[in-house]
């Protein structure tokens, strides 16, 4: 049929649960490109009527819930004007078992599901939650051993749990649960973490760079919108939180009445010998008492900031 | 049940290159810390060095010059190379891995071991 | 570099007695961990996070100390202990291992 068969991915997943998977494949997927969805090498393609419970949402394949006879091979082919690639994606589809305390972790997750905490240092946990824009994502609560997760050590920020301080009691069978909605209908996000603990220091010491800001200014009108990116370059195995923080505070706590100010969502892309991270912060609204206030973005020891300041009078 | 099998030849003479595999089951290794540990004659055990599971390394300053650890994702295997060696390199090599009770240090999982003898 | 001493080098032991092994660091670790290793066999986790005993260790092995100072100890020798331990530090890179202590049975 003249398609190109890139590779077979792997994937294990939840019964009862939503599950999506995108069909990417750079620099492939970054043109004029147009995306099906096929299963297990059927002529008919995944439906794209969302109220279906499985359904193709422009590149993604949306599972609302997945259940137990979804196992199988899922083909997204890649039409381009002169090209055609297809993905194979093998899903697997298990019980899950998060609070059997004779399951002494989950072997076969996928790497994601599987996350190690730095002893004696401030680490995190990602919860990984991969959906498209049509599917919108509450809060999110984290769990050890079935119990959910309190006190001062821990902090939730957007999709991330940090852990202060990482002891060998953090260790464990962890979950994070967030509740999807999807066209009106909600439906329970459950992801195991198997997190195990190490002292190694893992990224050999070195220091992450914070490419942008660099204590500099910005001139901004009183009443606007900005958005600042803090871009970092680090080490691929890096365990280092990257925020934005405000008189030593994380600005989501800051605000945490107005949510005038937000730290947006973590995005990276893959280099080589590197990570390129970029992390947002959004002044929905820019006021007086921001001006000469340093913004910090912290990527591990490294920091730096954005201060704000008022555009000189044009005097024309 | 993880388990890691090792490969690789007994005998290199001095300045060639020692190549061993660790080929492993039963685990992802791009899951925890990959480790090569040696003992030399007369029980001296010496950590030589990781591979991370994103595929950063970690050598031993004594044998940074010579020590190289690679893996092929695709085989689920490891390697180690050490160029130059000498008779001083002689010594049992393994291939060991932790996670056991969520400890990535807890070295429980091992190779069976290659003794290596460096001889012209 | 951490260097990691254990005293005695060879111990000599009786059936039934109780013995103790000590590993000095020279400067602080976190966590030691220990490993018995028996010839022609490759090294066994003994005891892992300085106190707990990994799968198939029997109850008469303990492991203790905090600092420098840390020690393995066997409240009833039996004739299956004879092998020598090592312990072992994460701690600091270099990751470095103990000279090992052999135990013998008298």
């Known amino acids: 049929d003249g398609c190109n068969d890139i590779f077979m991915k792997n994937e294990m997943l939840s019964a009862s649960q939503p599950f999506a998977f995108n069909c990417t494949f750079p620099p492939i997927t970054s043109g004029e490109v147009s995306v099906t969805w096929y299963k297990n090498s059927s002529k008919i393609p995944v439906s794209k009527i969302i109220q279906s419970r499985i359904h193709q949402d422009e590149t993604w394949i949306l599972f609302l819930p997945m259940e137990w006879g979804d196992s199988g091979v899922y083909q997204c082919v890649i039409k381009g004007r002169d090209s055609c690639h297809r993905i194979h994606v093998n899903l697997t589809v298990f019980e899950k078992q998060w609070c059997d305390t004779s399951v002494k972790g989950l072997p076969n997750l996928s790497d994601e599901y599987k996350q190690i905490l730095h002893l004696g240092k401030d680490d995190s946990l990602t919860c990984h939650l991969h959906f498209p824009k049509s599917c919108i994502l509450g809060p999110i609560k984290w769990y050890k051993d079935c119990n959910e997760i309190t006190g001062e050590r821990f902090t939730v920020l957007e999709t991330r749990l940090l852990v202060s301080n990482v002891s060998a009691e953090d260790r464990g069978n962890y979950a994070c649960q967030v509740i999807l909605t999807h066209s009106g209908k909600q439906y329970e996000v459950l992801n195991g973490i198997t997190v195990s603990i190490t002292e190694r220091a893992g990224y050999g010491g070195s220091v992450p760079k914070i490419i942008y800001p660099k204590n500099n200014s910005i001139e901004v009108q009183l009443g606007t919108t900005l958005i600042v990116d803090c871009n970092i370059t680090d080490t691929k195995d890096n365990t280092n939180l990257r925020c934005w923080r405000v008189n030593n505070t994380l600005v989501d706590d800051y605000y945490n009445e107005s949510k005038r100010i937000r730290e947006g969502v973590e995005t990276h892309a893959s280099f080589r010998e590197y990570n390129l991270y970029t992390v947002n912060i959004t002044f929905l609204e820019v006021k007086m008492e921001d001006y000469g206030l340093p913004f910090m973005c912290h990527a591990g020891v490294s920091a730096a900031y954005i201060m704000l300041q008022l555009p000189a009078p044009d005097f024309r | 049940e993880v388990q890691l099998q090792q490969s690789g030849p007994s005998l290199v003479k001095p300045s060639q290159t020692l190549s061993l595999t660790c080929s492993v089951t039963g685990a992802s290794i791009t899951s925890g810390y990959w480790n090569w540990i040696r003992n030399f004659p007369g029980n001296k055990l010496e950590y030589m060095?990781?591979?991370?599971?994103?595929?950063?390394?970690y050598y031993n300053p004594s044998l940074k010059s010579r020590i190289s650890i690679t893996r092929d994702t695709s085989k689920n295997q490891y390697y180690l190379q050490l160029i130059s060696v000498t008779t001083e390199d002689t010594a049992t090599y393994y291939c060991a891995t932790g996670g056991y009770d969520y400890v990535e240090d807890a070295l429980y999982y091992w190779g069976q071991g290659t003794s290596v003898t460096v001889s012209s | 570099e951490i260097l990691l001493t254990q005293s005695p080098a060879i111990m000599s032991a009786t059936l039934g007695e109780k013995v103790t092994m000590s590993c000095r660091a020279s400067s602080n670790v976190r966590y030691m961990y220990w490993y018995q290793l028996k010839s022609g066999a490759s090294p066994k986790l003994w005891i892992y996070l300085t106190s707990n005993l990994a799968s198939g260790v029997p109850a008469r092995f303990s492991g203790s100390g905090s600092g420098t100072s840390y020690s393995l100890t066997i409240s009833s020798v039996e004739a299956e202990d004879a092998a020598t331990y090592f312990c072992q530090q994460f701690t600091t890179s270099p990751y470095t291992f103990g000279g090992g202590t052999k135990l013998e049975i008298k």
């Open positions: 060095g990781y591979i991370s599971y994103s595929g950063y390394t």
